[in-house]
């Protein structure tokens, strides 16, 4: 049956042509319509949907004077580096009035050497570890096969027939090379060569020898390193903070690590220089001439506690009568510990030595024996901790207290439990 | 042969919302442009707007600008004219109409009758 | 917007008369975009001649179209009592507007 107005005749007097080609190539579509009146915007569509960024050009050739006049209407669509993205069917479309036409289709297609999608990267692998390497490549034509190859060596006897998308290797003991080509119909595509880096082992067992307060003998045994002798390894401690929380596994410490090299073997390292009664996080990592492995899971470790390096400070010992009023301050020195107290000691001349431990206080009234005419009385006070005794300070001789002096009453070490008022007398 | 069937008739109060469809076949919807007429009891005819089928895009007249909007269901062949808060003027028969190449309206739809009351 | 001016607004014609009913437009337009309808009492509008001249399918050759500019007519040559309508011209040549019929 006859349309309502005939005016459903298509305006395309040229439609798009063909392009098949290889990967990279320049082509050009066209077409062709010829309109009475205003010529419309050509728009370009790809299978089914509008291009928005076409890189199209328009041009317009008036057959007359009249703006009823036929026009001649060319668009040209150009295809620069034809890549897979830009194959299928091409159709040119115009708005007319109130009404739609689409050219007859044009195809674009693609044929030629394969091209690679994936190609083995490099990468760093430990000795005698599996690991995968990718390849994939695409025509058309299809089919594409794919042969890979290690130092330059087939890996299978002919495309196709060995390992494809995915290549297992099950370990290497020195470093190589990986490749692949893609075969099809219309030749072959090498894919880049990929350098296989082949590094130690992580060293494992990683384990305390000794431990002195600012020293810690360490150990491990170390990885496989392929015909690679290990060069060294090195070792890392850093302090534990509290709220650090380094997992096995976080990547860095929070501060800069103390880092220690060692010449192998043997694997062992003594770290000097540390706190003492600190807790540590050590790791390791062994070299070769290919480089380092990975380092080994942070292990918390902690130096034991030592003796304090000096003795109390600052120490008077006062006498009046049968007391004496001696009093200290803590050292100086670091104490390599928790301070759990002082000793004293004091001796006459011609008497024993009276050892006291005075607890954490520091200060003590002393009740002496006898009338108190006991001569050239000296008094000594080390610190000590859990690991034991600190230096014994110097002795230090009783001085006689002097009217005017203040005379504070002081809890007698004979009556430890009596709580007292402290004056202070400095 | 081609045909363009709109839906029934509707009675509706001021201030509601009315929805009218218009169904083409015997042809490529997405070919044509769809526009919507208005004609109020014993008054000719008045252009709505239209809208391209293929793009979706909707172009209304000065005097259907606002409470007026037209849509497609493409898949269905079928575009819809709706009318927001509706007034006592917009009681009317509307029709759709399919558009050509040089702004004839070649079909039309048998129209809808939307009366509104309270 | 163009205002298209039809006359006469209202008009009674007999059998075998010729009938002609003029369109103004306010502005010149194309002749492409000039087209008539013709609306029977209870029915849908139906596309009558396009692009001034054109008969559209099943319309009887007794209708014919002519004009240009601003001024266009459309004329029954031989009145039927089928023909008993309202006849719409209509513009597409910028907004779109109908006659008053």
């Known amino acids: 049956a006859p349309r309502g107005t005939q005016a459903e005749e298509s305006p395309f007097v040229g439609n798009p042509g063909n392009i098949t080609g290889a990967r990279g190539l320049t082509g050009t579509l066209r077409c062709q319509l010829q309109v009475q009146g205003e010529p419309p915007e050509v728009h370009w569509l790809r299978d089914g949907q509008i291009l928005e960024l076409a890189d199209s050009t328009q041009t317009q050739v008036p057959l007359g004077e009249d703006e009823q006049d036929d026009w001649i209407v060319v668009s040209q669509l150009r295809i620069t580096s034809l890549q897979l993205s830009d194959t299928g069917q091409y159709q040119c479309l115009v708005f007319l009035g109130h009404q739609t036409f689409v050219s007859q289709p044009g195809y674009v297609g693609l044929e030629g050497l394969p091209y690679f999608l994936e190609e083995p990267e490099d990468r760093t692998v430990a000795a005698n570890t599996p690991f995968n390497l990718s390849c994939q490549a695409q025509g058309p034509p299809e089919p594409v096969d794919l042969l890979w190859l290690q130092d330059a060596v087939p890996l299978a006897t002919a495309p196709g027939h060995g390992p494809q998308r995915s290549l297992h290797v099950p370990g290497l003991n020195k470093t190589s090379s990986f490749s692949c080509e893609a075969h099809n119909a219309k030749g072959v595509t090498t894919s880049r060569t990929a350098t296989i880096t082949v590094l130690p082992q992580q060293p494992r067992n990683l384990h305390l020898v000794s431990r002195q307060p600012t020293e810690l003998e360490v150990a491990w045994t170390p990885g496989l390193s392929g015909i690679y002798p290990l060069t060294h390894c090195t070792l890392q401690a850093v302090l534990s903070d509290d709220g650090m929380g380094i997992q096995a596994g976080e990547p860095d410490p929070p501060e800069e690590p103390l880092t220690s090299q060692a010449s192998v073997p043997p694997h062992q390292l003594r770290l000097g220089s540390l706190h003492p009664h600190t807790p540590y996080h050590i790791r390791v990592a062994c070299t070769s001439s290919q480089g380092p492995s990975s380092w080994t899971h942070w292990l918390p470790v902690e130096t034991p506690e030592g003796v304090p390096l000096g003795p109390p400070e600052n120490i008077s010992a006062t006498r009046n009568g049968s007391q004496a009023f001696v009093h200290w301050q803590e050292p100086r020195a670091p104490l390599q510990g928790t301070l759990l107290g002082y000793r004293l000691a004091y001796q006459g001349q011609d008497t024993p030595e009276v050892l006291m431990d005075i607890g954490l206080r520091q200060e003590v009234t002393l009740e002496l024996q006898g009338d108190g005419s006991v001569s050239n009385l000296t008094v000594c006070v080390a610190a000590y901790t859990a690991a034991g005794d600190g230096p014994w300070s110097l002795p230090v001789p009783l001085e006689a207290w002097r009217p005017g002096q203040a005379q504070p009453v002081h809890q007698l070490v004979k009556e430890p439990s009596t709580p007292a008022f402290s004056w202070p007398w400095w | 042969q081609i045909q363009l069937v709109q839906s029934g008739p509707e009675l509706k109060k001021p201030g509601e919302t009315v929805k009218i469809s218009c169904k083409a076949s015997?042809?490529?919807?997405?070919?044509?442009?769809m526009n919507w007429v208005k004609q109020a009891p014993g008054k000719g005819l008045k252009w709505m707007g239209w809208i391209n089928t293929y793009t979706g895009e909707p172009t209304y007249a000065d005097d259907f600008k606002g409470r007026f909007a037209f849509s497609l269901e493409t898949s269905a062949s079928t575009a819809y004219l709706q009318i927001n808060n509706l007034k006592n003027e917009d009681m009317a028969t509307y029709f759709c109409a399919r558009g050509d190449r040089f702004y004839a309206m070649d079909y039309w739809g048998q129209g809808t009758s939307v009366t509104v009351s309270s | 917007e163009i205002v298209l001016t039809q006359s006469p607004t209202t008009m009674a014609a007999s059998p075998g008369e010729k009938i002609t009913i003029t369109c103004s437009a306010s502005?010149?337009?194309?002749?492409?975009?000039l087209h008539w309808y013709q609306q029977k009492p209870g029915f849908s509008p139906k596309l009558l001649i396009y692009?001034?001249?054109n008969l559209a399918s099943g319309v009887p050759t007794r209708f014919s179209g002519s004009g240009s500019g601003t001024s266009y007519s459309l004329t029954i040559g031989t009145m039927e009592a089928e023909d008993v309508a309202t006849y719409y011209c209509?513009?597409?040549?910028?907004?779109?507007?109908f006659g008053s019929g």
């Open positions: 692009r001034t001249s």
């Open positions: 015997g042809y490529t919807f997405t070919n044509y442009g």
């Open positions: 502005s010149s337009i194309s002749s492409n975009y």
């Open positions: 209509q513009q597409g040549s910028s907004i779109f507007t």
